[in-house]
């Protein structure tokens, strides 16, 4: 299976790292090459190298290899950061366990099973032997390290320094014994790099011999390092693509850890009477689907065969025939006992009421002093005193420490949307708490909307390229794709962030989504040179009732002539009535033959009261909504446009003033559109961008 071109799979990669030799006696060999694969081939074969190659660095800028007879664990060497360098270390020299019989073991254990020190291979004292380093080139018979040059049963061994004991095996564990995982291994980040049948895993950053979509840069949180076994997609256990062209993928033999506990960040909030979120933590005993059909037992294969067994999904509590959500579906479900209906959702289980009785806040909750200490997604709040540094980073005054006791929900930064807390979860640094405004509370949370006190535009002018304002550029327009298709619009407001609508996500599996930037055509035809396709790494839902989502991209967009960001308005600003604005989208046009190109409809801002009259008084707009009517009868946003922007210009600056969300029909004459008012949520957007970690380009 070890073909020449695949030797890079035998190396552990450390990106942006090089090795510096402190000991001048250490040798190095360099040469100009095109790829890291070429470096790996030469290192593995030791071709033309005056030493045994243990590691190499690929200099991407100079297209150069630096081969080393040492690695990062050697003495006289130190690691150093360097943007243009990638360090590759031969795994055989850094592994402290064996695969199979341990023929490839090149570690530094030098004591036998019974504790006797090994005799050096180059020595004939106390035991004469024929295992000379010169006779076994490539077997690394260095020093007195345990080796298995002939691949014999029993694993690595050595001649011992005890004249009474000629040789003995060394006690080096099998890698499959050392490695262990919890549950189904979704959080496994170990170093197993071969499958249960012994096939070497394909590197995740390679597309040969098998093309795949699990690219490390697209899924930075999945731990796609080198060619280690991982479980990115909810399989029963970790797996990998293999180097065997005839075997696309295989499971890895990783045992379950003796102390099979999940990481805190993995544990969904357990509930028994109701569903929290998607119901992954539901542990109740409802055992029929929504229409009363009984569930099939999870440990049964009748009437439906499946692999969702208790053995395969160890931490998902697949007991009896209770409704569960082991795979991240939209809610708990089960296989049914009706042979004609394979699965059904248990949608009769109520959602948990998170409003905690009488707990409520007034205004924006800055004086809330209740003792709720859980976020709306069920995460436990972390202590305020552990997070003061982060808090100081986004507020410019000294918070009232007397209010910030324990881990209770509070509002120290005057957030317009109520009390919140830090979570201790690096993916969700903070979130709002499930507390509502007190009934009858009319305290405004932002300035009176009837008086245009704040201008929406910041003072800076529109960027100018070659002396011409880029007024025709719509590079901030995003096509959100779901399973190959355009589903919604969105606005690129920062290199790693897209503002869109919560209605755009029919599934919570982020693998199903992509963001297309720089396109004009809904299918990307003719846009190949300017199109950027980015995966989605996280969804951050807006404050309760906002319908907004901030979508984090797996890597930052590259800003160029075709892709740009659009500005946000000032918080709480008002835009004058009759201001001319535009909506953009690839949605439903009503045309029999649509050309697929991005369309624009011109609207003008209408005051909330006037807007309500146009809707025959059936709707009352609040401070979180903005209204715009069509200049041309029958034009406006529709299905497929949701998530897209309402763009207005003020002081020669274009900004996203509204987000399109499903309304009351499409482009009905004399019925203005109602959009989410971005200015009302501007502080929330800035706070997310400031506090959430994004991948570096």
């Amino acid at each position: 299976q070890r073909k020449r071109r695949n030797t890079i799979h035998e190396f552990k990669k450390s990106a942006k790292t090089t090795l510096i030799k402190i000991d001048p006696a250490l040798k190095i060999k360099t040469k100009k090459v095109n790829t890291a694969d070429q470096c790996a081939n030469r290192c593995t074969r030791n071709k033309g190298l005056p030493f045994t190659c243990k590691a190499f660095v690929f200099d991407k800028a100079r297209k150069q290899c630096l081969w080393f007879p040492f690695n990062s664990m050697s003495s006289g060497v130190k690691k150093e950061f360097g943007h243009e360098f990638d360090l590759y270390e031969n795994k055989d020299y850094i592994r402290n366990c064996i695969i199979g019989k341990g023929r490839s073991y090149k570690g530094t254990v030098s004591i036998t099973k019974s504790g006797i020190k090994c005799q050096p291979w180059s020595s004939m004292i106390p035991h004469e032997h024929s295992f000379l380093p010169s006779s076994y080139r490539g077997k690394d018979l260095q020093e007195n390290y345990c080796r298995n040059p002939r691949g014999e049963e029993g694993g690595p061994w050595c001649f011992t320094s005890n004249p009474e004991v000629r040789y003995e095996v060394c006690d080096i564990p099998q890698c499959s014994e050392v490695e262990c995982m919890t549950c189904n291994g979704e959080s496994y980040r170990g170093l197993m790099d071969h499958t249960e049948s012994g096939k070497i895993c394909q590197r995740w950053d390679h597309q040969t011999p098998h093309r795949h979509k699990f690219l490390p840069e697209r899924y930075p949180d999945k731990g796609f390092d080198d060619n280690y076994c991982r479980n990115p997609d909810g399989q029963p256990r970790p797996w990998c693509y293999t180097l065997d062209p005839h075997t696309r993928w295989e499971y890895c033999a990783i045992k379950t850890c003796a102390d099979n506990t999940m990481n805190d960040t993995d544990v969904p909030l357990e509930t028994t009477e109701c569903i929290q979120g998607q119901g992954e933590g539901y542990r109740g005993t409802v055992n029929t689907i929504w229409n009363g059909i009984p569930c099939q037992r999870w440990d049964s294969q009748y009437p439906h065969e499946h692999d969702m067994t208790p053995e395969n999904f160890k931490c998902k509590d697949l007991r009896e025939n209770y409704c569960r959500n082991p795979d991240g579906s939209e809610s708990p479900w089960c296989f049914t006992t009706d042979p004609n209906i394979r699965v059904g959702y248990c949608s009769q289980i109520p959602n948990c009421d998170m409003s905690h009785g009488q707990d409520c806040y007034r205004g924006n909750g800055k004086n809330y002093m209740g003792n709720l200490s859980q976020t709306r997604s069920g995460l436990t709040c972390s202590m305020w005193d552990k997070n003061m540094e982060d808090l100081h980073r986004h507020i410019f005054w000294e918070p009232d420490a007397s209010k910030l006791n324990e881990n209770y929900c509070r509002n120290p930064d005057d957030d317009a949307h109520g009390p919140w807390c830090y979570t201790g979860n690096p993916l969700i640094p903070w979130d709002y708490c499930p507390i509502s405004r007190c009934e009858g509370d009319t305290t405004p949370t932002i300035v009176n909307l009837d008086h245009p006190v704040i201008s929406c535009a910041k003072t800076k002018q529109l960027r100018v390229v070659n002396g011409i304002p880029t007024r025709t550029n719509i590079g901030w327009m995003v096509s959100l794709r779901y399973r190959n298709k355009h589903i919604c619009g969105g606005s690129l407001i920062k290199e790693s962030w897209v503002l869109t609508a919560r209605q755009c996500f029919p599934s919570r599996d982020l693998k199903d989504y992509e963001a297309w930037l720089g396109i004009h055509d809904v299918h990307g035809r003719g846009d190949e040179k300017c199109k950027q396709v980015l995966n989605v790494s996280q969804l951050v839902y807006g404050p309760e009732g906002s319908d907004l989502v901030l979508m984090k991209l797996a890597r930052p967009a590259v800003l160029d002539d075709f892709v740009s960001t659009i500005d946000l308005p000032n918080y709480g600003c008002t835009i004058p009535e009759k201001t001319s604005c535009s909506v953009y989208g690839w949605g439903y046009t009503g045309l029999i033959n649509y050309d697929g190109l991005l369309r624009v409809a011109h609207l003008y801002i209408m005051g909330n009261e006037k807007c309500s009259q146009h809707h025959r008084g059936k709707v009352t707009l609040n401070e979180s909504e903005i209204c715009a009517g069509a200049e041309k009868i029958g034009s406006g946003p529709c299905e497929g446009d949701y998530g897209g922007p309402l763009v207005c210009e003020q002081h020669k600056m274009r900004m996203v003033l509204g987000v399109i969300v499903p309304g009351r029909g499409c482009a009905i004459p004399n019925r203005p559109g109602i959009f989410v008012r971005v200015a009302y949520y501007a502080k929330w957007i800035h706070k997310i961008i400031l506090t959430y970690k994004v991948p570096q380009s």
């Epitope: 939209e330 809904v522 029999i592 697929g596 299905e639």
Partner: antibody, heavy 120, light 108 residues
Framework: QVQLQQSGAELMKPGASVKLSCKAT????????IEWVKQRPGHGLEWIGE????????NYNEKFKGKATFTADTSSNTAYMQLSSLTTEDSAIYYC?????????????WGQGTLVTVSS | QIVLTQSPAIMSASLGERVTMTCTAS???????LHWYQQKPGSSPKLWIY???NLASGVPARFSGSGSGTSYSLTISSMEAEDAATYYC?????????FGAGTKLEIK
């Protein structure tokens, strides 16, 4: 106006394969998905899958993977569905329909259907 | 998969009568992704209502659609002879796309 013209009825033996066609006129063929739907008496309508002729992109209902294969010829504005290893269960009317260009859109135009009968 | 249950399976109505048929989904469906088709014997289905409440081109104004979440309905304000047909609801919320078993509307 938009029209989808399907090929004529087919009488097939079990185990054989059949290739149905759907010729589109009156719109830009490459810009809309072509949907395939099966209708058996007493079984209602079943979605088989779809193809975007411009890119050759396909989505299949898991149930029909291995049974149906979609292709499209943009020079003749024709979409094809091949059904393999036919059994009596495959006897049905097969419709092609025009899907939208965005997720969630309805099937706004339908072909007249092709009746496939599988019998020994 | 999302199962769509239509009721009643068969119904008859007098001319001029108000008719309502329902479509219940096994899990929540976005109103943007719920459509209705009309099919008459020997003909192919026709798009009738898209995105819950929008009438397709040429559909008489006596038809209307409404609903959200798991519960949707199609209503005819005043039954006419040409409305006798089978009506199918269809969800595009989640793959595989599914259709209801249909409601057959007959003239009394």
């Amino acid at each position: 106006q938009v029209q989808l013209q399907q090929s004529g009825a087919e009488l097939m033996k079990p185990g054989a394969s059949v290739k149905l066609s759907c010729k589109a006129t009156g719109y830009t063929f490459t810009g809309y998905w072509i949907e395939w739907v099966k209708q058996r008496p007493g079984h209602g309508l079943e979605w088989i899958g779809e193809i975007l002729p411009g890119s050759g992109s396909t989505n299949y209902n898991e149930k029909f993977k291995g049974k149906a294969t979609f292709t499209a010829d943009t020079s003749s504005n024709t979409a094809y569905m091949q059904l393999s290893s036919l059994t009596t269960e495959d006897s049905a009317i097969y419709y092609c329909a025009r899907g939208g260009y965005y997720y969630g859109s309805s099937f706004d135009y339908w072909g007249q259907g092709t009746l496939v009968t599988v019998s020994s | 998969q999302i199962v769509l249950t239509q009721s009643p399976a068969i119904m008859s109505a007098s001319l001029g009568e108000r008719v309502t048929m329902t479509c219940t989904a096994s899990s929540s469906v976005s109103s943007s992704y719920l459509h209705w088709y009309q099919q008459k014997p020997g003909s192919s289905p026709k798009l009738w209502i898209y995105s819950t409440s929008n009438l397709a081109s040429g559909v008489p104004a006596r038809f209307s659609g409404s609903g959200s979440g798991t519960s949707y309905s199609l209503t005819i304000s005043s039954m006419e002879a040409e409305d006798a047909a089978t009506y199918y609801c269809h969800q595009y919320h989640r793959s595989p796309l599914t259709f209801g078993a249909g409601t057959k509307l007959e003239i009394k």
